[in-house]
Interface confidence: medium
């Protein structure tokens, strides 16, 4: 494949990692909110 596309393989990986990080962050926020709610 040509060089213009080769960076896309990196892009695919980076985007997948970004999305995993966001999902993890959302889970942590939800857990934090649950702890706060439960303590009220």
């Amino acid at each position: 494949d040509n060089p213009s596309l080769s960076i896309d393989l990196t892009f695919h990986l980076l985007r997948t990692l970004l999305e995993l990080a966001r999902t993890q962050s959302q889970r942590e926020r939800a857990e934090q909110n649950r702890i706060i709610f439960d303590s009220v």
Epitope: L5, I7, D8, L9, F11, H12, L18, E19
Partner: antibody, heavy 116, light 111 residues
Framework: EMQLVESGGGLVKPGGSLRLSCAAS????????MNWVRQAPGKGLEWVAE??????????HYAESVKGRFTISRDDSKSTVYLQMNSLKTEDTAVYYC???????WGQGTLVTVSS | DIVLTQSPDSLAVSLGERATINCRAS??????????MHWFQQKPGQPPKLLIK???NLESGVPDRFSGSGSGTDFTLTISSLQAEDTAVYYC?????????FGQGTKLEIK
């Protein structure tokens, strides 16, 4: 040489269906995410749908405007990506472009006209 | 959704002069290593063509009079010396998250 060739466009009545195809060549199709982007006559660009790889379980994503009506799919053995369009509305009238990866390459587009 | 706002909507520049198009995102589209912003050129009757990838990476075969810069929420496409064939509509687009969105477009004409 890389090529993306769309087909399947045409005139359809509101509520009708169409299936667009995009045949790819000149690169390792199975390695890349594929997208559909559309452009209404005289308007700007709107991303429509994306399909990822076998290793991503062929994950799909859609614009809110088409969610539940359009389905993107791919056949890696044929190096082809599809867009099944159901319950078409007049506002779906546009040129539909198939694109590869981060929208690196675009086909010439196929015109979909939804009109009674 | 991330909203991309381009300015100006249209631009007339003399041949050989510099043209600058701006794109502002409603939230950051950058990490410490990558800027998820891209620039396209579209001429009448043709599909868009990728010019700049990841804010500043010139696509293969694109003349080096085109350049891109920026990070976070503010990005710029610059044409250092405008040529007649640069008459087109230019779009920015982000790939930070789903849905990918485009700017409204900037029409560039020769003065």
């Amino acid at each position: 040489e890389m090529q993306l060739v769309e087909s399947g466009g045409g005139l359809v009545k509101p509520g009708g269906s169409l299936r667009l195809s995009c045949a790819a060549s000149g690169f390792t199709f199975s390695n890349y995410w594929m997208n559909w982007v559309r452009q209404a006559p005289g308007k700007g660009l709107e991303w429509v749908a994306e399909i990822r790889l076998k290793s991503n379980n062929y994950a799909t994503h859609y614009a809110e405007s088409v969610k539940g009506r359009f389905t993107i799919s791919r056949d890696d053995s044929k190096s082809t990506v599809y867009l099944q369009m159901n319950s078409l509305k007049t506002e779906d009238t546009a040129v539909y472009y198939c694109t590869v990866g981060t929208l690196v390459y675009w086909g010439q587009g196929t015109l979909v006209t939804v009109s009674s | 959704d991330i909203v991309l706002t381009q300015s100006p909507d249209s631009l007339a520049v003399s041949l050989g002069e510099r043209a600058t198009i701006n794109c502002r995102a409603s939230q950051s589209v950058s990490t410490s290593t990558y800027n998820y912003m891209h620039w396209f050129q579209q001429k009448p009757g043709q599909p868009p063509k990728l010019l700049i990838k990841f804010a500043s990476n010139l696509e293969s075969g694109v003349p080096d009079r085109f350049s891109g810069s920026g990070s976070g929420t503010d990005f710029t496409l610059t044409i250092s010396s405008l040529q007649a064939e640069d008459t087109a509509v230019y779009y920015c687009q982000h790939s930070w998250e789903i849905p990918y969105t485009f700017g409204q477009g900037t029409k560039l004409e020769i003065k």
